[in-house]
């Protein structure tokens, strides 16, 4: 996988009225890094990992860099010609990569209202835009609003995919490995359901990057998706995530059923315990 | 003697259909995974659908799918494989095949039948 | 669909020789991993199961390795009833099988 840098921003209006706050999260590696909070911007690392990778001295770089992105795009959202009322909201995501060859990929993308109405490759400088009406009037919008703004357009906008790269090689270079491995504990439990049946819970914790499979396997046949339920994968505060997979099966054929792990090129099975080990909450209620 | 047995294999003209059985005898059929598996003339195996043994999980390869209906009746001891809007490219030797339960397996075929010729003719 | 490539598609071996069959899957699979034996008219046969296991009733002289997406059945000495056809089957997303290795007489 290639390294990345992710910058996610948000600014909100309420009937017209642009929020004086944004909200700002980074995401290094895939990893959430950095999060600028709405009302002050105050770049606070997630974890001791990313503390190591900024250092304290550099926070204030941040800070600054995200405050004017911030105002940038406030800017835009008052620009934008749309309906006034209620609550709106405007994102800009900005992606760049650095793989292994050496090559790198750098994107933005607009959202408003949560739809994507507007994206520019920023190595190419070229725009797409999804086919729908609306999307297409809000591109119009915006893109005239930076063009209008030569001196942003120039300095802010064109420098991204520069200032994107140059920032993902400065973390890259600061002596800490991002792509370290943290292999997952696997339990797997049980617990009563009815009629003969009872629901197993494989649950992976603990583990880094993020990308797992976890999945029930039949005989060493995989379940078909509608057959299994699956938890998000959610960070578990220490830097590393969790997730479960559950199904359920006939009491008695216990053997025949395994947890698969796959992560980071390890994988394992697990088996369902034979002794009763009751779990209270079942996620198929 | 643990065996499988198609059968309802035959010459049939192309977009026809045709239902193979497949008896199990010796074991609990309801107990384990089964699939068919085919072997055009002179070629190699193709799996070409999976059902598990509660019927919850079925698969199919993508040159039958919407085609070939998977399904069995446990008390009869039988595996089916409905097959319509047949092809040329269809013409055959059918095998069912068991998926072996013995623990650490990995989607093993155990048990095979000894097949049966379906020939699609145009 | 995950792809499953023998090699070679035939070879050509005496009696008493070590034959040895590859099998690359296009991602890897683990070691979900299954070899078979085919007689002319005949059904399939397995031999190995989960990249190394030997099913229950086969000669010792059957090996299989390998994990991921790089696979090996070894015949350490062949046998004349081992002149016959040999797949690998992968089921680690869904199943399906490779193109067969002939084993003839050489």
């Known amino acids: 996988e290639p390294h990345s840098l992710r910058y996610n921003l948000t600014v909100l209006s309420w009937d017209g009225s642009v929020q004086s706050g944004f909200l700002t999260e980074v995401h290094l590696d895939g990893q959430p890094f950095l999060r600028c909070d709405r009302q002050k911007c105050r770049a606070k690392p997630q974890g001791q990992w990313a503390e190591d990778v900024l250092g304290n001295k550099t926070w204030d770089r941040e800070t600054r860099d995200l405050t004017g992105n911030g105002k940038d795009l406030r800017m835009t959202l008052a620009h934008i010609k749309d309906q006034k009322e209620g609550l709106h909201s405007l994102q800009e995501i900005r992606v760049c990569e650095i793989h292994e060859d050496n090559s790198t990929r750098s994107s933005q993308h607009f959202y408003y209202d949560g739809e994507l109405f507007l994206s520019q490759n920023l190595e190419t400088k070229e725009w797409t835009m999804p086919q729908s009406s609306r999307a297409q009037t809000l591109a119009m919008n915006v893109r005239n609003f930076l063009k209008e703004d030569a001196m942003k357009t120039k300095t802010h906008y064109h420098a991204m995919h520069a200032d994107c790269l140059q920032e993902l090689r400065r973390y890259l270079k600061s002596g800490v490995v991002l792509r370290r491995t943290v292999p997952p504990m696997v339990n797997v439990t049980r617990s009563e359901a009815s009629e003969g049946n009872i629901t197993v819970t494989c649950r992976a914790s603990g583990f880094y990057p993020w990308n797992i499979t976890l999945s029930w396997r039949q005989d060493g046949v995989s379940l078909s998706h509608d057959t299994q339920q699956w938890g998000d994968v959610l960070p578990d505060g220490n830097g590393t995530y969790q997730t479960w997979v559950a199904t359920r099966i006939c009491q008695g054929e216990e053997q025949r059923f395994t947890c698969y792990m796959e992560h980071s090129g390890n994988h394992s099975t697990h088996p369902v315990p034979s002794g009763k080990v009751l779990v209270l909450q079942s996620h198929w209620q | 003697e643990v065996q499988l047995v198609e059968s309802g294999g035959g010459l049939v003209q192309s977009g026809g259909s045709l239902r193979l059985s497949c008896v199990a005898s010796g074991f609990t059929l309801s107990r384990y995974s089964m699939n068919w598996v085919r072997q055009a003339p002179g070629k190699g195996l193709e799996w070409i659908s999976y059902i598990s043994s509660r019927s919850s999980t079925i698969y199919y390869a993508d040159s039958v799918k919407g085609r070939f209906t998977i399904s069995r009746d446990n008390a009869k001891k039988s595996l089916y494989l409905q097959m319509n809007s047949l092809r040329d490219e269809d013409t055959a030797v059918y095998y069912c095949?068991?998926?072996?339960?013995?623990?650490?397996?990995?989607?093993?075929?155990?048990?095979w039948g000894q097949g049966t010729t379906v020939t699609v003719s145009s | 669909d995950i792809q499953m490539t023998q090699s070679p598609s035939s070879l050509s071996a005496s009696v008493g020789d070590r034959v040895t069959i590859t099998c690359r899957a296009s991602q890897s699979i683990s070691s979900y991993l299954n070899w078979y034996q085919q007689k002319p008219g005949k059904a399939p046969k397995l031999l190995i199961y989960a990249a190394s296991s030997l099913q229950s009733g086969v000669p010792s002289r059957f090996s299989g390795s390998g994990s991921g997406t790089d696979f090996t059945l070894t015949i350490s000495s062949l046998q004349p009833e081992d002149f016959a056809t040999y797949y690998c089957?992968?089921?680690?997303?869904?199943?399906?099988f490779g193109g067969g290795t002939k084993v003839d007489i050489k």
């Open positions: 089957q992968q089921s680690y997303s869904t199943l399906t």
């Open positions: 095949a068991r998926v072996s339960d013995i623990t650490g397996n990995t989607g093993s075929f155990d048990i």
